[in-house]
C-alpha cells in the first residue's frame, strides 16, 4: 500500500439508540440489504470471471450482544468501508448507512486492512461479498422461523 | 439526500482570522472523509486537507499548512477550517467536499456551495 | 505532487458534436488495480459537481452522455452529443497520492 493510504479509519465511539431494535426492524433493514448485496456480488463476478469461491476473508456475521438473530453492524461495516473504493460506490454508501442502523453501542468498529497483492484483494472483496450475501440469508431464515 | 451546507460569506481584515463551517446532512457524517478546497477568483481548484471526522485525522496540502486548520463537531455534524493570519491572496471561495470511507483516498462526491472570503483593509 | 495536465485549455463545440478533453497525469495514478482519477463539472458560482468516478464509473444521476476512459498517465472525458447544458469548466482530479492535485480545466463553449 502507498504511504498516502496509510491513515487510520477506525474505533470512532458510536452511541446506539436507547431502544433495542424489534425482529421486525431488523427483518426490515435486511430485505433492503439484500438485493443491494445480491446485485453487488452479481456485478462483481461479472466483472471478475474465473475467481475461484473464496474462503479468503471470515466476515463476522451474528452480534453477541443481543437474544435476537441479529446481523453484526459494528463488526461488518468496516468491510465495506475498506472495499468502497475498489467497488460500487453508491451501492455500498446504502448498505453503509444500513449497517449502521445495526450497530450496538458496546461493540467497537474493527479495523480492516485491504490486501496489497492484486489476486488477494479481489479474493477479499469476493469473499466480503459472499459471505455479507449468505450472513443476510441467515439471518432473515432465523428471523422467519422464531416468534413474529 | 446528502447536503454539505457551508456558512456564508465573510469580509475580514488583512492579520485577522475567520472560522468557517460545513453542516452535512443525509449520511452518516463520521465514515467519510470532509476535504477542502480553494478557488481564487477566475482560477482552478486547489485541494487544501481532508479530515477524517471519525477519529481527526487530517492530512493538509504543504502550501496550506500553518494557514488553515481543520476540525469536526461529530455531535453536530460539523466540519470547521479556520484561516489565519489572513492577505489578499487567502481572498477565495473554499468548498467542502465529502470524500472517501477508507485509507484509500476517493472522488469528492457532494460538494458545499461554498464560502467567499473577501480580504481588504 | 502528481500534476495534471488538462488539454486543451478551451474548447468550441457544435451542438450535438462530440467534446474531448484530456488529462495528463506526471505519474501513474493507478492503484490496486484501479485509476483513481475523476472528473467533475463546474458551472460559473457554483460548486464543482463529480461527473466520472474513478476514471470510467458515471456518477448516478449524470447523463450517458458523459464517458470517461483511461489509465495509469492519460485519461479522457467524453461528452457525446453535446448539449447546451454542457457550457462549463471542466476538471480532472487524482486521488490516488495526497496531496489531492486538480487539472487547469478546460472551458466548453458551443459553437
Known amino acids: 500500500m502507498r504511504g498516502s493510504h496509510h491513515h487510520h479509519h477506525h474505533g470512532s465511539s458510536h452511541m446506539a439508540p436507547a431502544h433495542r431494535l424489534q425482529p421486525s426492524d431488523i427483518r426490515k433493514i435486511i430485505l433492503e440489504l439484500r438485493p443491494m448485496s445480491k446485485g453487488l456480488l452479481q456485478d462483481y463476478l461479472k466483472k471478475e470471471i474465473g475467481l475461484p469461491e473464496s474462503n479468503h476473508s471470515s466476515l463476522p456475521c451474528l452480534s453477541s450482544d443481543s437474544q435476537l438473530p441479529h446481523i453484526n453492524g459494528s463488526a461488518i461495516l468496516p468491510y465495506f468501508r475498506a472495499i468502497r473504493p475498489l467497488s460500487d460506490k453508491n451501492t455500498i454508501d446504502k448498505i453503509i448507512e444500513q449497517l449502521d442502523k445495526l450497530k450496538f453501542q458496546r461493540e467497537p468498529e474493527a479495523k480492516v486492512s485491504m490486501p496489497a497483492d492484486n489476486f488477494e484483494r479481489k479474493n477479499f472483496i469476493l469473499a466480503v461479498l459472499q459471505q455479507f450475501s449468505a450472513c443476510l440469508e441467515h439471518v432473515l431464515q432465523s428471523l422467519n422461523s422464531g416468534p413474529q | 439526500q446528502v447536503q454539505l451546507q457551508q456558512s456564508g460569506a465573510e469580509l475580514v481584515k488583512p492579520g485577522a482570522s475567520v472560522k468557517l463551517s460545513c453542516k452535512a446532512s443525509g449520511y452518516t457524517f463520521k465514515y467519510y472523509d470532509i476535504n477542502w478546497v480553494r478557488q481564487r477568483p477566475e482560477q482552478g481548484l486547489e485541494w487544501i486537507g481532508w479530515?477524517?471526522?471519525?477519529?481527526?485525522?487530517?492530512k493538509y496540502n504543504e502550501t496550506f499548512k500553518g494557514k488553515a486548520t481543520l476540525t469536526t463537531d461529530k455531535s453536530s455534524s460539523t466540519a470547521y477550517m479556520q484561516l489565519s493570519r489572513l492577505t489578499s491572496e487567502d481572498s477565495a471561495v473554499y468548498f467542502c467536499a465529502r470524500g472517501g470511507t477508507s485509507v484509500i483516498r476517493d472522488a469528492m462526491d457532494y460538494w458545499g456551495q461554498g464560502t467567499s472570503v473577501t480580504v481588504s483593509s | 505532487d502528481i500534476v495534471l495536465t488538462q488539454s486543451p485549455a478551451s474548447l468550441a463545440v457544435s451542438l450535438g458534436q462530440r467534446a474531448t478533453i484530456s488529462c495528463r497525469a506526471s505519474e501513474s495514478v493507478d492503484n490496486y488495480g484501479i485509476s483513481f482519477m475523476h472528473w467533475y463539472q463546474q458551472k460559473p458560482g457554483q460548486p464543482p459537481k463529480l461527473l466520472i468516478y474513478r476514471a470510467s464509473n458515471l456518477e448516478s444521476g449524470i447523463p450517458a452522455r458523459f464517458s470517461g476512459s483511461g489509465s495509469r498517465t492519460d485519461f479522457t472525458l467524453t461528452i457525446n452529443p453535446v448539449e447546451t447544458d454542457d457550457v462549463a469548466t471542466y476538471y480532472c482530479q487524482q486521488s490516488n497520492k495526497d496531496p489531492l492535485t486538480f487539472g487547469a480545466g478546460t472551458k466548453l463553449e458551443l459553437k
Open positions: 479530515i477524517f471526522p471519525g477519529d481527526g485525522g487530517t
